[in-house]
């Protein structure tokens, strides 16, 4: 399949100009290759009309011109002063003509409407509102007021001031009459449909002094906005519909065959099924405009969508809309997605995202996707040292291995845990890439006691069973804050007595606390890793509290606690809900979410700048 | 789901080579960290190497770095580790993983004899 694309139809009026965009992969022997605009014959040929390299044919001198945009992967046609003759198909293009890398676009040009002498045109979107200004004169003031459509060769009344509507026209007409001092009357008609378009004429007063204004209504078809984005990428649809439908349903819709416009999303709940995870409705704004981002493109997304307003949440004929044409180009340089993640409650997984390795330096995200509410999806952690209320001591995102993947490592897992995340950075917006964990069956790999309490000025061992299958791994202790988990001093005590059917491969490497102070309070993780790939984890919360009885505190598995099923937060803490991936526009501003962290939530640890090497091997 | 074929294995005389491949059908092939493996006759399955997804990040047990090199061909759904100066403790099962740092997704293993 082309990977070329631009507009399969272009229509326009005699005299008008047209602006062809045409769309293609941005590599490097693309951007310099010629452009082309061809005309299609009869026998198949396509006889150049315009290049990239400077020809122009005789039938487009000194009126066309095409323009490359080589950063952005476009280049456009532009054709002034249409006649008819220029209808017909024709191909945008790369290379050669015959080779086949081009896009067919069908160009039709009609002939201008032939309009009477004093005809006013209205030229209207679908879906919207239309006001035809009707003057007239004193005498008339007090006379019947009407509006007719010419069909065919016969006026049919719409609308009149003696309260008579049309049926095509009810519940989506008015008539209203100026004050005295206006001699003006006007015709409100709004939920414009295409089959509104024709002539009109405005009549005060039915004898031979009658006053009459002639209007042309033309309803235009919203043109669809070209869309070009990678396979496995993400597309952002945003929705200007206007104020006057702010509290009307909203909706996305893909046209299938027909006129059929199936309900991807809409503010009423619904989402179709294969976009479960990877879509996104956004709330709307003051003026009723929304957006919508979908994630993970498939082949099978590419097509015409349109999204509208109207009570049903679903097209209906008078829905104001706005249209998109999506190419989906295969020749993707983002990885396939949803990864699926297993692990089991109470154990632990570590997430490796992609991300564009041109964009190290990008802040690095972690957001669980929500069904509800239209599909959402709130920050739960990024690599500025900012993690959600709920998540601390269990989450951390670190920046390795790098060079295009970060690792985010979550634990103590809950069945609850079990659903879509996004992985996305505050540069590309396109690399938004979704992974499923699944809660399977099974035992954590690692054996921690529940929680600990360690005593001011004690010693304080805490024990961490590694089993055989983890013989080859580098094992580790480390202090969980916000920026990350910075490692300790371990100490391997050799073989472990908790495992069944296993030999001197497993392992019990203990955590040593000496003369424990209050900054040693808080969350432990023990864990598994092979250099700066991060395997399983296990989590341990230490309490201290004052002295008792003197001696140090040996904790062994059996003498812990049970892990606690929710971990109880400070005061100091609060929820930051509205930290969601909402509209991506605002990572062009990064101090927004900056700002919305900050306010809300007053625990922000400074970030980290040491590398892992100058940290002894921690996980920042 | 991610399904995984190894192949390549063999018996080969110390100092030699030979490189082994792993092809993955399933459609998410390309987002997954890939990683070998190796189980010696009565020993634990024990790591051998992992790239990331894109290739821009490998790792490597002591045992086998300088040796072996893992690479990946995201076009072909393949990950390939390249054993060179191959010695008899060596001689395992060598199995491919998709997410090898979780609960991966195993294959079956292909047999790697090193004779003396």
């Known amino acids: 399949k082309s990977p070329i694309f631009g507009p399969e139809e272009v229509n326009s009026v005699e005299g008008n100009s047209v602006s062809i965009t045409c769309y293609y992969p941005p590599t490097s022997v693309n951007r310099h290759t010629r452009k082309y605009w061809c005309r299609q014959g009869a026998r198949g040929g396509c006889i150049t009309l315009i290049s990239s390299e400077g020809y122009v044919s005789s039938k487009y001198a000194g009126r066309a011109n095409l323009t490359n945009f080589p950063e952005n992967g476009t280049f456009v046609v532009n054709i002034a002063q249409l006649s008819q003759d220029d209808s017909g198909r024709y191909k945008c293009g790369l290379g050669i003509n015959s080779r086949g890398l081009s896009f067919d676009v069908s160009l039709e040009v009609s002939q201008g409407p032939g309009l009477l002498n004093d005809t006013k045109v209205y030229t209207v979107d679908l879906g919207r509102t239309v006001t035809i200004n009707c003057p007239f004169k004193t005498e008339n003031a007090q006379k019947r007021k009407s509006l007719y459509k010419q069909i065919g060769l016969y006026p049919v009344l719409v609308i009149d001031s003696s309260g008579y509507v049309n049926p095509n026209y009810t519940g989506r007409i008015r008539l209203d009459i100026q004050g005295t001092g206006q001699l003006l009357f006007s015709v409100v008609i709004n939920q414009l449909r295409l089959s509104d378009a024709g002539q009109y004429l405005c009549q005060a007063g039915d004898d031979s002094n009658s006053n009459k204004k002639n209007a042309d209504l033309q309803v235009l078809k919203p043109e669809p906005e070209l869309v070009y984005e990678d396979l496995r990428g993400s597309v952002t649809f945003h929705c200007a519909l206007g104020p006057e439908v702010a509290n009307v349903a909203k909706f996305l819709c893909r046209q299938s065959s027909g006129e059929n416009c199936d309900v991807v999303v809409n503010t009423l709940g619904k989402r179709a099924p294969a976009f479960e995870g990877r879509i996104l409705l956004n709330p709307q704004d003051k003026d009723g405009s929304f957006s919508v981002v979908i994630t993970g493109l498939r082949k099978e997304d590419a097509g015409r969508y349109l999204c509208g307003a109207h009570s049903d949440g679903q097209l209906q004929e008078g829905s104001p809309i706005q249209a998109w044409q999506l190419f989906v180009n295969e020749e993707s340089t983002i990885p396939r997605s949803p990864t699926v993640v297993k692990g089991v409650a109470g154990g632990s997984v570590a997430v490796l995202c992609p991300y564009n390795r041109k964009e190290s330096k990008s802040i690095k995200y972690w957001c669980l996707w929500e069904g509800a509410q239209n599909g959402r999806c709130p920050l739960l952690v990024d690599s500025e040292g900012w993690v959600k209320a709920q998540y601390e001591g269990r989450l951390s995102l670190l920046e390795e291995p790098g060079n295009g993947t970060f690792t985010v490592i979550l634990n103590q897992l809950t069945s609850r845990d079990a659903g879509f995340y996004w992985c996305l950075t505050n540069g590309d917006t396109l690399w938004r890439t979704t992974v499923e964990i699944k809660i399977i069956e099974g035992e954590p790999n690692l054996k921690v006691p529940g929680n600990v309490t360690a005593v001011l000025g004690e010693t304080l061992k805490v024990p961490c069973h590694f089993p055989c299958k983890f013989s080859s791994y580098e094992k580790y202790w480390c202090k969980w804050n916000n920026t990350g988990c910075q490692a300790l001093p371990s100490q391997d005590e050799g073989p472990s007595k908790a495992f069944v059917n296993c030999d001197e491969n497993s392992r019990l490497v203990s955590l040593t606390l000496n003369l424990v102070t209050r900054a040693d309070e808080g969350w432990y993780w023990c864990g598994v890793k092979q250099g700066h790939f991060y395997g399983e984890t296990a989590a341990v919360y230490v309490a201290v509290e004052e002295r008792k009885a003197a001696g140090s505190r040996d904790v062994s598995l059996a003498k812990a606690d049970a892990a606690p099923d929710e971990k109880v937060l400070d005061s100091g803490f609060r929820e930051i809900e509205n930290k969601a991936i909402q509209d991506p526009r605002l990572f062009a501003e990064e101090k927004a979410v900056a700002d919305t962290r900050d306010q809300a939530d007053g625990s922000r640890a400074s970030v980290d700048s040491g590398s892992s090497e100058e940290q002894g091997g921690s996980s920042r | 789901q991610v399904q995984l074929v190894e192949s390549g294995g063999g018996l080969v005389q110390a100092g030699g080579s030979l490189r082994l491949s792993c092809a993955a059908s399933g459609r998410t092939f390309s987002s997954y960290a890939m990683g070998w493996f190796r189980q010696a006759p009565g020993k634990e399955r024990e790591f051998a190497a992992v790239?990331?997804?894109?290739?821009?990040?490998?790792h490597y047990a002591d045992s086998v770095k300088g040796r072996f090199t893992i690479s990946r061909d995201n076009a072909k759904n393949t990950v390939y580790l390249q054993m060179n100066s191959l010695k008899p403790e060596d001689t395992a099962v060598y199995y491919c993983?998709?997410?090898?740092?979780?609960?991966?997704?195993w294959g079956q293993g292909t047999q790697v004899t090193v004779s003396s």
């Open positions: 993983a998709a997410d090898p740092m979780n609960s991966p997704y």
């Open positions: 790239i990331t997804w894109n290739g821009g990040s490998t």
